[in-house]
Interface confidence: medium
Amino acid sequence: QEFLLRVEPQNPVLSAGGSLFVNCSTDCPSSEKIALETSLSKELVASGMGWAAFNLSNVTGNSRILCSVYCNGSQITGSSNITVYGLPERVELAPLPPWQPVGQNFTLRCQVEGGSPRTSLTVVLLRWEEELSRQPAVEEPAEVTATVLASRDDHGAPFSCRTELDMQPQGLGLFVNTSAPRQLRTFVLPVTPPRLVAPRFLEVETSWPVDCTLDGLFPASEAQVYLALGDQMLNATVMNHGDTLTATATATARADQEGAREIVCNVTLGGERREARENLTVFSFLGPIVNLSEPTAHEGSTVTVSCMAGARVQVTLDGVPAAAPGQTAQLQLNATESDDGRSFFCSATLEVDGEFLHRNSSVQLRVLYGPKIDRATCPQHLKWKDKTRHVLQCQARGNPYPELRCLKEGSSREVPVGIPFFVNVTHNGTYQCQASSSRGKYTLVVVMDIEAFSSH
């Protein structure tokens, strides 16, 4: 008769470092002491007729255990295979690029250390919860890669690596380990440079708006903008509208920046940069300044009028040009009554990069002269009808402007000048029209002949 030696449990599965209770039993009636052969740490727990129980501790790797016993002088054996499973010690997704261009491939890399049995270990690369790649864990450490085409939708998406130790066939379930997620930042930066709108010329101490625009940028809110006039950084206000970025600044030129300069606009996103440059000439254009040797001159005095402007500026005073750019234009005159209120015009021209810039300035001369009454405007003999409406059209001139009064001789009767009044026979007579100012008096005699109203 053949007797058997049973080993229980048969082909068990346990977690790494665990313990196992093993029972060896035989139906042989005359068996000797049962022995357990194993490289593992073992301890006889109990034994009896035809059976022995052992405890195996700190089981770290797969092993085969063998029970043997002598039965009627011949050896019988039984065996069991222990399968040990262990979760990976480390699951790590390698860092992603700081910025990834949309439309270009990038590589996801996951490294897995430990985990057994390897035949049951799978490595999964994920975007959100979407599986991108599923591969067996091959070497130790297992290194799994997947190539991903970056899209706009990937901006801010978490990528992770998951291990699956499938012990379901052994009735133990699916053990999942997941790496810390890593977030991807994707971007689009067009190859075209920004559009830079800036003045060609900028006068010292003046301000002008500068605009820099770039379309097709993603994410526009993450872009950095640098606007500068030469080495002077401009304080830009940046606005985003969809995929368009607009930076606006005010450029103010300093005196030390005079000459050929550049306005620069840099847009940086994802570690890449797009740049636009525009040439600009900073110029200084002083004047023109028109001066009178005497702003208020006495009649008959000599007045000098001069016009000056900055270097390289050509000035022309009342049609008379200065000898050369940068020089002063001058003219002299004997002040007369007719020069009072006269304006002297100076035009200045500056050439900047082949373009001519023009400026004008003027000054008005005051000439002081005594009062006069213009005979042409003040008739000396007036024939008016009684009970009619008339205006005494007399005008005085002088600087300072004189006061004009017309008084009837022999009385203090005054007729209004320049405004309508009703004439009657009492107005008949001779009038002294006198213009007076701080510079003297001027008198003109006016006779009013009033024809009485006749009723038939």
């Epitope: 790590e92 390698a94 890399r109 490294q111 049995p117 067996p136 290194e143």
Partner: antibody, heavy 119, light 112 residues
Framework: EIQLQQTGPELVKPGASVKISCKAS????????ILWVKQSHGKGLEWIGK????????TYNLKFKGKATLTVDKSSSTAHMQLNSLTSEDSAVYYC????????????WGQGTSVTVSS | DAVMTQTPLSLPVSLGDQASISCRSS???????????LHWYLQKPGQSPQLLIY???NRFSGVPDRFSGSGSGTDFTLKLSRVEAEDLGVYFC?????????FGGGTKLEIK
């Protein structure tokens, strides 16, 4: 063109150390694994170990653990192998090679560096 | 370690002949993922080894179709349908299923 350029021959004294280098070009250095192989007259080709330039992780043939140290310098796309406590047994030609994850074969090899250990 | 045994040690051939090299492993080279990581390399005189065949039967880019690989488990073969002068050198088989990776001792293909 993918190339692995190794440093020139070395003549070293017993007990000394030597560091040989392998500069990669024509591909993304961190995308492939670098392996080192020894070829000596008596023993044919022997695999020393491998290094993943991206993670810097290494796997050694136990026979060469303590003898060889593998490192990489990502900034210059260069792999290094230092051999220490040299004896005449270490006289050989040492090759660097690369492999992709799949196929798991050494698809490109360096030209080899001859190391002679002699007093 | 997986010990790789190549036969013959030397293979004298005439140009245009067929040649066959055998490689046997001391353990199965089938990985738990189902792939078999057995590769063939050629080392021409004074040169570094170069990859011919990877994973039993896949020709590496630029390798002529007169080279073919076959086999499974522990027994593998490299065949050359028509030997040309540029094929002369030492042929090595190698496995990367198990760490450490190991190589065969080499087969020298030479002219009769």
């Amino acid at each position: 063109e993918i190339q692995l350029q190794q440093t020139g021959p070395e003549l070293v004294k017993p007990g000394a150390s030597v560091k040989i280098s392998c500069k990669a070009s024509g591909y993304s250095f961190t995308d492939c694994i670098i392996l080192w192989v020894k070829q000596s007259h008596g023993k044919g080709l022997e695999w020393i170990g491998k290094i993943n330039p991206y993670f810097g992780t290494t796997t050694y043939n136990l026979k060469f653990k303590g003898k060889a140290t593998l490192t990489v310098d990502k900034s210059s796309s260069t792999a290094h192998m230092q051999l220490n406590s040299l004896t005449s047994e270490d006289s050989a030609v040492y090759y660097c090679a690369r492999k992709e994850a799949y196929p798991d074969a050494m698809d490109y090899w360096g030209q080899g560096t001859s190391v002679t250990v002699s007093s | 370690d997986a010990v790789m045994t190549q036969t013959p040690l030397s293979l004298p051939v005439s140009l245009g002949d067929q040649a066959s090299i055998s490689c046997r492993s001391s353990q199965s080279l089938v990985h738990s993922n189902g792939d078999t990581y057995l590769h063939w390399y050629l080392q021409k005189p004074g040169q570094s080894p170069q990859l011919l065949i990877y994973k039993v039967s896949n020709r590496f880019s630029g390798v002529p179709d007169r080279f073919s690989g076959s086999g499974s488990g522990t027994d593998f073969t490299l065949k050359l349908s028509r030997v040309e002068a540029e094929d002369l050198g030492v042929y090595f088989c190698s496995q990367s299923t198990h760490v450490p990776y190991t190589f065969g001792g080499g087969t020298k293909l030479e002219i009769k």
